[in-house]
């Protein structure tokens, strides 16, 4: 076959050369860019940006290469595009720095940056970082830093990304209420920094306020579903980014709901609780308490990471006609208590014409020592003999 | 596989307390009771009481009110026994066990073998 | 508290022999009885749950019957592994209790 004679010619049946001297100065417009997976470009120094804009439709592309060339600098979202890219060698350019934000979401098997000029500074720390922990290939690169020495010798001890402090009211914050959120940045070389709202949808009107160093946020209105969720300051800086997240506590009463038994491997009287703080739990049948035992007893559902409502069983293992009745569920809470019953029948009474057959509601010689209130919490199973019964 | 892990033995003076410990694992420690039994060397098995890992809730049969307390540390999966007030009556060895699929106990621990003696 | 009651207290027989302990509880519990097989010096090991369901791994010679207060654990075929001591236990609530066992020997 005849030498291609453009400055970039195709290599296998997704790959493209580009070694033609000084033929590039921008990748844009290259041709069968969308089903590219492999660029390899060669001795072109006029190529000396890489944006956003230049990899824009090379969303299938996993090995970048761009060697022996004059690029200076790399957009810290110069990959937005390429999210698969996995293999990146830029050695032999001018470098002098490279973002953490460019590799930033990215699966980077292989990053190579030999033989560029590198500009010791903490805005490579995170390069610093790679090589200690081993990744990329960066360790066998033994990289250095112009007329500096080793990369591994840079001191890194000022080299830290933004501390935050977020402060969330003291008090108790109520239904309706208005709540004053403020996050302190503080580190060196600040650039960016910001709230993270995404969960907060209806919970409240959101106002932001003031610039950094120090971030204001009003939360106003405020109604109970914004427990559980999650409000994120995040601050970046040149050696990377950092998030704190904190949660706003907005009191409300108890709350509770009772339904009809299901005969599941036990039987189940399903239940859910609501409230802020979480409610303590009792339960009566036919009036009085009844102490939980290895047979009878509360098993909550794994909770949803964003609500307070508990979900869960009053758990009856292999229950008879003495366990037939009215169970009463109480919740209570600093701001209210509720209850709910239902009546639960189980099996029929086998000696119903005999009113002299013993009933063991309870057997008094077993000492319950009953926290009642601490919620017990399932987890990732449903064990099937875990449960609970005889009152 | 579910597994219950007790220490072989514990020598005791009387009148000395000593702690018996548990350790569970091969399945959701939160999910399940634990259980002690007592067996006197030559005897049957006597039910102590049982405790719920979740919240530490305990029931105890009348005689072992003031002689056990049970207690669970969640984070090591391990459920613990302190005997109290010891006397040569307690010499015994004192298993753990749990439910299986049913309320009967399909999983025991080793035991431990306790000795009161001066 | 449920007394259980259990009979005999020993028992001798011989490999190939067929068996059969007994137990008495003080009151109804339906069939909410368990039977164990202890070894000298082991954990027991449980035989059958719920009267007569038998626990995983339990070999088909053992068989448990009974109703509210009377219930028999039957061995049929007896092997040299089966010897040691049986117990019953109710689990129809708490507290828990177990018979004083039954201490099966080689004749």
């Known amino acids: 076959a005849a030498p291609c004679p453009d400055a970039c010619c195709p290599h296998g049946s997704s790959g493209l050369r580009c070694t033609r001297d000084g033929a590039l100065d921008s990748l844009h417009h290259l041709p069968g860019a969308e089903n590219l997976t492999e660029l390899y470009i060669e001795n072109q120094q006029h190529l000396q940006h890489l944006e956003l804009r230049d990899l824009r439709g090379l969303g299938e592309l996993r090995n970048l290469t761009i060697v022996k060339s004059g690029l200076r600098f790399v957009a810290p979202d110069a990959f937005h595009f390429t999210p698969r890219l996995s293999r990146l060698n830029l050695s032999f350019n001018a470098l002098e720095s490279l973002s953490w934000k460019t590799v930033q979401g990215l699966s980077l098997q292989e990053l190579v940056l030999s033989g560029n000029p590198l500009h010791c500074s903490c805005a490579l720390r995170w390069l610093q970082r790679w090589e200690e922990e081993g990744l990329g290939g960066v360790p066998e690169q033994k990289l250095q830093c112009h007329g500096q020495g080793p990369l591994a010798h840079m001191p890194n001890a000022s080299c830290g990304v933004p501390t935050l402090k977020v402060q969330v009211p003291n008090a108790s914050v109520d239904v309706g209420d208005d709540v004053l959120l403020r996050c302190q940045v503080e580190g060196r070389g600040l650039e960016q920094a910001g709230w993270i709202l995404t969960e907060l949808e209806q919970s409240a009107t959101v106002m932001k306020s003031g610039g950094l160093p120090s971030l204001g946020l009003t939360l106003a209105n405020v109604t109970s579903d914004l427990n559980r969720k999650n409000v994120t300051c995040w601050a970046e800086n040149d050696v990377g980014r950092a998030e704190v997240s904190v949660q706003v506590n907005v009191s409300f009463p108890a709350s509770v709901q009772l339904h009809t038994a299901v005969e599941m491997h036990h039987w189940c009287i399903p239940f859910s609780v609501d409230g802020q703080p979480a409610p303590s739990l009792r339960w009566l049948f036919n009036g009085s308490v009844l102490n939980e035992t290895s047979f009878i007893f509360t098993e909550f559902l794994e909770p949803a990471a964003n609500e307070t409502v508990r979900h869960g069983c009053l758990r009856l293992n292999q229950p008879t006609h003495v366990n037939n009745g009215n169970y009463t569920l109480l919740a209570a809470n600093p701001f209210g208590q509720a209850s709910a019953s239902i009546m639960a029948a189980f099996m029929d009474n086998p000696f119903e014409f005999n009113p002299e057959d013993p009933i063991p509601v309870s057997f008094s010689p077993v000492d319950t020592n009953s926290t009642s209130g601490d919620p017990v919490e399932k987890k990732d199973e449903t064990p099937f003999g875990v449960s609970v019964a005889v009152g | 596989q579910v597994q219950l892990q007790q220490p072989g033995a514990e020598l005791v003076k009387p009148g000395a307390s000593v702690q018996l410990s548990c350790k569970a694992s091969g399945y959701t420690f939160t999910s399940y009771w634990i259980h002690w039994v007592k067996q006197r060397p030559g005897q049957g098995l006597e039910w102590i009481g049982e405790?719920?890992?979740?919240?530490?809730?305990?029931n105890y049969i009348e005689k072992f009110k003031n002689k056990a307390t049970l207690t669970i540390d969640k984070s090591s999966n391990t459920a613990y026994m302190q005997l109290s007030g010891l006397t040569p009556e307690d010499s015994a060895v004192y298993y753990c066990?749990?439910?299986?699929?049913?309320?009967?106990?399909?999983?025991w621990g080793q035991g431990t073998l306790v000795t009161v003696s001066a | 508290d449920i007394q259980m009651t259990q009979s005999p207290a020993s028992l001798s027989a011989s490999v190939g022999d067929t068996v059969t302990i007994t137990c008495r509880a003080s009151?109804?519990?339906?069939?909410?009885l368990a039977w164990y097989q202890q070894k000298q010096g082991k954990s027991p090991q449980l035989l059958v749950h719920?009267?007569?369901t038998l626990a995983e791994g339990v070999p088909s010679r053992f068989s448990g019957s009974g109703s509210g207060t009377q219930f028999s654990l039957k061995i049929s075929s007896l092997q040299p592994e089966d010897f040691g001591t049986y117990y019953c236990q109710h689990h129809y609530g708490v507290p828990l209790t177990f018979g004083a066992g039954t201490k099966l020997e080689l004749k």
């Open positions: 009151e109804n519990i339906y069939t909410y």
């Open positions: 719920n009267t007569k």
């Open positions: 405790i719920n890992p979740n919240n530490g809730l305990t």
């Open positions: 066990a749990k439910y299986g699929n049913y309320v009967a106990f399909a999983y």
